[in-house]
């Protein structure tokens, strides 16, 4: 694969003239501080840019905001600061965009020293704004009801929960002493409350409440709550134990009406639980190790969220910074990448292709050599830089990138050796969802996926010099064209493209400095004149996902089915287009024992696919046995893996056993069983809105 423009990349030559005619520069003539961008709606071309400049003077901060609006994907911007009455907008709350294509926008004003606050709201994609006075000061960004964008929820700095049903015009206070609130499905709101001093003081003694009618009636659904979180169709709560300072996870699939204890280890005060990923089938749960180790264990749940299988040991998740590299590869189902902390304290990347069933190292790219971290120069792996590396201020401009509509493509910074290296990383690409990798670009880059994978763009990270070049590829990163988008380099801060990777436009943001001031500047490049032809049937080829051995008639079978996709040929230079829909054809596979997990009280011996009964129950298994619900203790030893669609083949049906007989213990009293089995549970969940960017569902 070439990283330079050469003979093999001759198709990309002469692009300059075509791109120059569709490169648009915009200079923001204001004091530069920070800039926030938000796309309003899907395919509307509307972008809002909020620039903020803040100066701390003694005890207060004075600042200035400017609001700009584009209707052409960032090619031109209009200064619309007058629409918000030149008010200073709180940049920490960002621009709150409504769900779906509602066209709704909320900006929260900074009204220093007042008992109330002000918001600016728009229902027409930011074309006009009206201001509304708030009877409270928001503690965090106002949240929309996912199913009705007129209904808003807010938590105040005095821990009051407020609701508006008319898009911010009128507000009613729902509850006092609220720590955390989250939207459930429909009109359901879950929230935790404290009784005595504060959220922090009452941690572990909070109550979990639910309203299903927007605050007309309330129900306590949990007590002794430490934290709560939502993931897929599961409601989780960590609940303090009666006997000590430990807590454990309880789960509900009926919005908190009934709870079951999860078969997971309990954790102490210094530990935490975190939902790494969840869907309607299952959940990935991280359980922190005791002590300040910086790692824990990943468990994967059954379809009830109750029984858990150990998935990965020594999973890196720092207690202090709350950083984990756990990444859902959205371009191929079942694929996740994360990091483990090995015994020698080096960090290694692991990948699973079957939703946490098995983890392996990433295959070494064929066009790369093993680095200094490798003991054997012929055998090593690719290690991916993600959130942890970024938090450690390594030269990693971007986290791994994948998009659901760019099937199989994963782009990431990495190094090739026995562990992650602190040396300057290169950029690697996989076109098959992480099975194989190739070095794509030398050195750190910012990158973006455009046109559903038909176009990749990248800009070299250059902290000390200005940037005036963008690289682009139409063949999934094999060949790169280079385009000089400006004569005068800019101090580059980032690439911006419309979420969803369907656009043909990309914006490069940065600033220019003169002796007296610096100002924001953006360049928007439209690649439509370079790639003019619309893709046709002949441009696509059939690709089997998860293919590892074409001679096996179970090839590609993951979670009981295989999928064939129509994918753009690398050699085709054409536009997928905004309306492109991924074409995939699933086929059911025959069942094998691999399609089943071991139910509670059973385990798989090393190198065996059969589930064997545990001779005795210890630790958290025993606790689950004592306090778990009756019906969860009757099993034939196997459960179909959540989301597995296999049919026929092996059916491991055997005698159903009641494991209740095994529930004996000196230190846990069985009489507590009944009060616990259906007892209420819950949790407060959320020191973790900082995890939004990382897609961590919930972290205590």
């Amino acid at each position: 694969r070439s990283t330079e423009q050469g003979e093999s990349c001759s198709g990309l030559l002469g692009a300059d003239a075509k791109l120059a005619g569709n490169t648009h520069q915009h200079i923001f003539n204001d004091l530069s501080g920070s800039v926030s961008l938000a796309w309003v709606g899907d395919g509307t071309g509307v972008i809002l840019a909020l620039t903020t400049f803040q100066v701390p003077i003694f005890m207060i901060t004075i600042g200035q905001s400017k609001l700009y609006r584009s209707e052409d994907y960032g090619k031109s911007f209009e200064d619309v600061t007058n629409l918000i009455n030149n008010t200073f907008i709180r940049s920490d709350f960002g621009i709150a965009i409504g769900p779906e294509n509602s066209g709704k926008v909320i900006l929260t004003a900074d009204v220093s020293g007042s008992h109330g606050s002000r918001i600016f709201v728009s229902s027409d994609f930011g074309k006009s704004f009206t201001h509304q006075e708030l009877p409270f000061v928001p503690l965090m960004q106002i949240t929309y009801n996912p199913e009705n964008s007129n209904v808003l929820l807010a938590l105040s700095n005095k821990n009051e929960l407020w609701l508006s049903e008319d898009f911010g015009t009128n507000w009613k206070k729902l509850y006092d002493a609220v720590c955390l609130a989250k939207w459930g499905s429909d009109n359901t709101i879950f929230f935790t409350t404290y009784a005595n001093g504060s959220c922090k003081a009452d941690l572990g003694a909070l109550e979990l409440w639910r309203t299903s009618d927007l605050g007309k009636s309330f129900k306590t659904i949990g007590v002794k709550i430490y934290s709560f979180g939502l993931g897929g169709r599961f409601l989780f709560a960590s609940v303090m134990a009666d006997k000590d300072t430990t807590r454990r996870i309880h789960v509900s699939t009926d919005q908190g009406d009934t709870w079951s204890m999860a078969q997971l280890p309990s954790v102490g005060q210094e530990q935490f639980y975190s939902i790494l990923a969840a869907n309607d089938d299952m959940v990935f749960m991280h359980v922190d190790e005791p002590g300040d180790t910086g790692f824990g264990t990943i468990f994967t749940s059954d379809d009830r969220g109750i029984v858990y299988s150990k998935s990965l040991d020594r999973h890196l998740y720092t207690t202090t910074g709350g950083e984990t590299d756990f990444t859902n590869v959205t371009s191929l189902r079942g694929v996740y990448i994360t990091s483990v902390l090995s015994e020698d304290n080096s960090i290694q990347t692991m990948i699973t292709f079957d939703q946490g069933g098995r983890w392996t190292h990433l295959r070494k790219p064929e066009n790369s050599e093993c680095d200094a971290t490798a003991k054997n120069k012929n055998e090593c792996s690719l290690h991916i830089h993600a959130s942890y590396s970024i938090s450690q201020k390594l030269n990693v401009p971007m986290a791994p990138l994948s998009e659901p509509n760019a099937v199989g493509i994963v782009i990431a910074h990495g190094s090739v050796g026995d562990a992650i290296s602190v040396m300057v990383p290169d950029v690697y690409i996989s076109d098959d969802g992480g099975y194989s990798w190739t070095k794509m670009l030398e050195g750190p880059h910012h990158y973006a996926i455009l046109d559903s994978g038909g176009l990749l763009v990248a800009v070299e990270q250059n902290a000390h010099q200005g940037v005036n070049q963008i690289k682009f590829s139409t063949d999934e990163g094999q060949c790169w064209g280079v385009y000089n988008f400006t004569k005068d380099p800019i101090f580059f801060t980032g690439l911006a493209s419309e979420p969803g990777a369907r656009s043909m436009n990309v914006s490069l943001w940065g600033y220019r400095s003169s002796l007296f001031h610096q100002y924001w500047i953006s360049f928007t490049i439209d690649f439509r004149d370079l790639i003019t032809r619309n893709c046709e049937e002949k441009d696509y080829t059939i690709w089997l996902a998860h293919s590892t051995d074409p001679e096996d008639y179970e090839d590609g079978c993951i979670l009981g089915y295989k999928e064939q996709f129509l994918r753009l040929r690398k050699s085709s230079v054409c536009q997928n287009g905004r309306d492109y829909v991924v074409t995939k054809q699933p086929s059911i596979c025959l069942c094998s024992l691999e399609d089943f997990l071991c139910d509670f009280g059973y385990y798989r011996p090393e190198n065996d696919s059969k589930c064997v009964e545990q001779p005795e129950l210890k630790g958290h298994d025993l606790e689950f046995c004592l306090y778990g619900r009756e019906e969860h203790l009757t099993t034939n030893g196997y459960r179909k893996i959540p989301g597995d669609k296999c049919q026929g083949g092996v059916n491991p049906v055997r005698e159903v056993k009641d494991l209740k007989k095994k529930c004996t213990s000196n230190f846990l009293s069985p009489e507590k069983q009944n009060s616990k089995s259906n007892g209420s549970a819950g949790g407060s969940g959320g020191l973790n809105d900082i995890f939004e960017a990382q897609k961590i569902e919930w972290h205590e």
Epitope: I542, L544, P550, Y553, G556, E563, Q564, Q585, S587, L590
Partner: antibody, heavy 120, light 107 residues
């Protein structure tokens, strides 16, 4: 020229045995999965058995399982089908077919076939 | 077992006419369906693989379409040499199966 040539067919009594061979030429035999497909007189095609390039995967139709054995010798560019406990319903033309190299690929090259008749 | 149902069983067609043969699978087989032509006293020959990909050397009048459970083989302008039996075949799941065949005769 890519070619597959079957041999070993003939008349055999019920309960008897027969070994079919298929000689391959014109391609790298050791890189392809190979198959046996049969066709009873005046009837359609029926898949019989499949063997992967290195013999790691071997598959049979239920109708022949336990009676037929597929094997190959990559050094000799040859595919075999050992047929035991033959029945009247095994009477057919037996074709040797190469499977393409893709996942779930088609049978892209076929031999001319060899006739097996099971009759008392 | 995946059952492939081909229709029609028999078709008598005038030269230059368009012929359409359908093949329906009892469950989804993705694109793993192939079409073969078998002339009298000859072995089968591959025409179309993966539902729509023409095999090398096959005349352009033969085309295939479909995915999932419904597939079609089209002969755009029938020629005399196209008189043969046509079979669909699925390779998605074991046991591998064939359709019952469609015999095309020239009027």
């Amino acid at each position: 020229e890519v070619q597959l040539v079957e041999s070993g067919g003939g008349l055999v009594k019920p309960g008897g045995s027969l070994r079919l061979s298929c000689a391959a030429s014109g391609f790298t035999f050791s890189s392809y999965s190979m198959n046996w497909v049969r066709q009873a007189p005046g009837k359609g095609l029926e898949w019989v058995s499949s063997i992967s390039s290195s013999s790691s995967y071997i598959y049979y139709a239920d109708s022949v399982k336990g009676r037929f054995t597929i094997s190959r010798d990559n050094a000799k560019n040859s595919l075999y089908l050992q047929m035991n406990s033959l029945r009247a319903e095994d009477t057919a033309v037996y074709y040797c077919a190469r499977r393409g190299s893709g996942s779930y690929d088609a049978f892209d090259i076929w031999g001319q076939g060899t006739m097996v008749t099971v009759s008392s | 077992e995946i059952v492939l149902t081909q229709s029609p069983d028999f078709q008598s067609v005038t030269p230059k006419e368009k012929v359409t043969i359908t093949c329906r699978a009892s469950q989804s087989i993705g694109y793993s369906l192939h079409w073969y032509q078998q002339k009298p006293d000859q072995s089968p020959k591959l025409l179309i693989k993966y539902a729509s990909q023409s095999f090398s050397g096959v005349p352009s009048r033969f085309s295939g379409s479909g995915s999932g459970t419904d597939f079609t083989l089209t002969i755009n302008s029938l020629e005399a040499e196209d008189a043969a039996a046509y079979y669909c075949h699925q390779s998605s799941s074991l046991p591998l199966t064939f359709g019952g065949g469609t015999k095309v005769e020239i009027k």
